[in-house]
Amino acid sequence: IHPSGVTGLVPSLGDREKRDSLCPQGKYVHSKNNSICCTKCHKGTYLVSDCPSPGRDTVCRECEKGTFTASQNYLRQCLSCKTCRKEMSQVEISPCQADKDTVCGCKENQFQRYLSETHFQCVDCSPCFNGTVTIPCKETQNTVCNCHAGFFLRESECVPCSHCKKNEECMKLCLPPPLANVTNPQDSGTA
């Protein structure tokens, strides 16, 4: 476990790994006596005091409300539960429990736009009005739309060609169809 925001409570990762390798799996080196291996605390609990001697129990306590540990550990305090960020439109998928962190996600028809590994914004998937879906909206990717004739793609939405200004990129997409198609009025653009 990487204790986020719990500095100074456990040895640095390198030291810890070196010392832990002296003990069998599921045990750790006593904080004050290198020759003693104590049993780690179960997930959902944290370390209150080291085992007094080999074969004696480590004293562990269950994580308080709003905190958790997701695996065996010898943390001196549990980790704070994540709060789903309302300002990023996140919703809680599953609440925090003593042995697992909160799971945050997005509502249906939304995708996750990542700011960092732990922060994302929930954004509405483009519905492709006036177009067809080429690639459906996925967990981290907006819908890719293909616009109907008379519409062009702007910011993932199909916009009428009447909104296309001269010299803009959309002029190419909004050109009237070749003469051969003139007989088919529903195909003609509005530019």
Epitope: Y114, S116, V123, D124, K138, T140, Q141, N142, V144, E155
Partner: antibody, heavy 113, light 111 residues
């Protein structure tokens, strides 16, 4: 630790081509939108190009449209910028930047035309 | 294209002072769908790459000291540095991500 490392910059003649690469590590590259941003010597920042996480959405700055191509390889954690028909005004430090909010930045690679 | 006008272009400050940098956009950056302003602020120190300070006009990025504050809505935005420190001497840029092409302000040099 998040790292973005650009490469491929150098001295090139006007009208020639160059491809820049950006290698990402320390984060789930395939989840992130990516951008290229440049900075001419002693000048401000200029956005160059954007590519969405799955490459479905691509946009360019007016100054490079039709000459530059942004692409990515999510399997290899790589971002690319293919630059064709280079002009003297393309001389700049080129940065790749990760996330829609440009939260992660590389140290840049210098392109001199 | 949205034009971003930043002011002042440079500013001489002393440690402990309060600093305000302005950024104006040629059109509103307020997204009606989510009621957020798509305006970011960046800090760039000499010889370094830029660093995200503020997004959504007022949300501080992880690890950014609380002396940095973003405010404003629509077309007028401000970056305030309360009690400026020597390590804050840098160039500051605003960026709109409301619509493509994205555009930066010309920058403000804090010296």
């Amino acid at each position: 630790e998040v790292q973005l490392v650009e490469s491929g910059g150098g001295l090139v003649q006007t009208g020639k081509s160059l491809e820049l690469s950006c290698e990402a590590s320390g984060f789930t590259f395939s989840n992130y939108d990516m951008n290229w941003v440049r900075q001419a010597p002693g000048k401000g920042l200029e956005w160059v190009a954007y590519i969405s996480s799955g490459s479905g959405h691509i946009y360019y700055g007016d100054a490079v449209k039709g000459r530059f191509t942004i692409s990515r390889d999510n399997a290899k954690n790589l971002l690319f910028l293919q630059m064709n028909n280079l002009k003297s005004e393309d001389t700049a430090m080129y940065y790749c930047s990760g996330s829609y909010w440009f939260a992660y930045w590389g140290q840049g690679t210098l392109v001199t035309v | 294209d949205i034009v971003m006008s930043q002011s002042p272009s440079s500013l001489a400050v002393s440690a402990g002072e309060k600093v305000t940098i302005g950024c104006k956009s040629s059109q509103s950056l307020l997204n009606n769908k989510d009621q957020k302003n798509y305006l970011n602020w960046y800090q760039q120190k000499p010889g370094q790459s830029p660093k995200l300070l503020i997004f959504f006009a007022s949300t501080r990025h992880i690890g950014v000291p609380d002396r940095f504050m973003g405010s404003g809505s629509g077309t007028d935005f401000t970056l305030t540095i309360n009690s400026v420190q020597n390590e804050d001497l840098a160039d500051y840029y605003c960026l709109q991500t409301y619509s493509f092409p994205y555009t930066f302000g010309a920058g403000t040099k804090l010296e």
